[in-house]
């Protein structure tokens, strides 16, 4: 799986859409999970609705909301007032019994807020993160970064990457 | 930037019990997976274990498992190594380490280590 | 455990040389999401070790790019093109795929 990333600017709310086969995932739930690092678990934020012909219904689980067109094959994650300790390695996952699909993995980035002078030394500013060793990019704001790329992107995006 | 300060020398002796701190500053503390590893003179490097200071997830090594507990404490944004039991064994430089990005876990940043020194 | 076996133990070099360092896994070292964990560390005398290479062959940030990590499944090699005096040191490979994870016993590079 490639590694979209997306950034957001701290205090803003950030979107963040994956995609999917809607007839291969038909009548399946779907899930955002938060995952500990590169190599740990994948811990759940919050799942659809229980009735997946409700999966429309937005459904939050503190500040992080998520909605489901199962029509169009697209889950929307909202992750309200973004901040510092939002960021990092998440999945959109659809669900089947006990397991789980991955449908996206998604690097989220959160943006120093260049109105706010306050400390910013826990926030990321374009420029400062370790290269992506084999992204590729999109555009809440999204791209994939290739290959040893250091991303320099603009104010609040969406980028891609293995 | 990034900062993991560790307390420069223990000297313990046999049976005692350390609890090593690391504390660290200038990232989210809570977003990075925080490494301990073992330095003995002629012996090269051992790592102990790891944790995940947003969830507390552990992994340890089965070696130091039943005498090593590694804790975090997100108000002071420090790591812990409780090691117990010690023998002089045990004497040599641990060090803290923290990965380097969400999307690169080499140990990028580490401690300048803390000398235990385990004599009667 | 997954046993890391570095070779040689002691490479004496002149500055400007090339010097190559292997590390062999006892075990394929790719981990269950398709990443293979290997890394590169230097430790020089009285400092903490420092992060070389990552992901096999990825370069850490500011690492010169006379390093060069390469290899696959279990057997690894990090050259230095041209040797220069701060590159002298205990090298370290380590595997992070599997835990227990384990680090190589170390290669001492040292002027001839």
């Known amino acids: 799986h490639n590694t979209t990333v997306f950034q957001g600017v701290a205090g803003q709310s950030l979107q963040v859409s994956c995609p999917y086969d809607s007839m291969k995932h038909w009548g399946r739930r779907k899930a955002w999970c938060r995952q500990l690092g590169e190599k740990g678990p994948c811990q759940r934020v919050v799942s659809t609705h229980n009735l997946w012909l409700l999966s429309f219904l937005r459904r939050w689980n503190g500040s992080t909301a998520i909605t489901d067109d199962t029509l169009g094959g697209t889950l929307t994650i909202t992750l309200r007032n973004l901040q510092p300790h939002d960021a990092g390695l998440y999945q959109c996952q659809s669900l089947h019994g006990s397991e789980a699909d991955t449908l996206r993995k998604v690097l989220v980035e959160v943006l120093a807020d260049p109105l706010d002078h306050r400390d910013a030394g826990d926030l990321w500013f374009p420029g400062e993160s370790e290269s992506f060793e084999d992204a590729h990019v999109e555009h809440s704001i999204s791209r994939s970064l290739l290959e040893g790329e250091i991303p320099f992107p603009p104010t609040s995006h969406h980028h891609h990457h293995h | 930037q990034v900062q993991l300060q560790q307390p420069g020398a223990e000297p313990l002796t046999p049976g005692a019990s350390v609890k090593m701190s690391c504390e660290a500053s200038g990232y989210t503390f809570t977003n990075f997976w925080i490494t301990w590893v073992k330095l003995r003179p002629g012996q090269g490097l051992e790592w102990i274990g790891d944790i995940y200071p947003g969830s507390g997830n552990t992994n340890y090594n089965e070696k130091f498992k039943s005498r090593a507990t590694l804790t975090v404490d997100t108000s002071s944004t420090t790591a812990y190594m409780q090691l117990s039991s010690l023998t002089s064994e045990d004497s040599a430089v641990y060090y803290c380490?923290?990965?380097?990005?969400?999307?690169?876990?080499?140990?990028?940043?580490w401690g300048h280590g803390t000398l235990v020194t385990v004599s009667a | 455990d997954v046993l890391m076996t570095q070779s040689p133990l002691s490479l004496p070099v002149n500055l400007g040389d090339q010097a190559s360092i292997s590390c062999k896994s006892s075990q394929n070292i790719v981990h269950s999401n398709g990443n293979t964990y290997l890394e590169w560390y230097l430790q020089r005398p009285g400092q903490s070790p420092k992060l070389l290479i990552y992901k096999v062959s990825n370069r850490f940030s500011g690492v010169p790019d006379r390093f060069s990590g390469s290899g696959s499944g279990t057997d690894f090699t990090l050259k230095i093109s041209r040797v220069e005096a701060e590159d002298l040191g205990l090298y370290y490979c380590f595997q992070g795929s599997h835990v227990p994870y384990t680090f190589g016993g170390g290669t001492k590079l040292e002027i001839k």
């Open positions: 380490a923290r990965e380097a990005y969400y999307t690169n876990p080499g140990f990028a940043y």
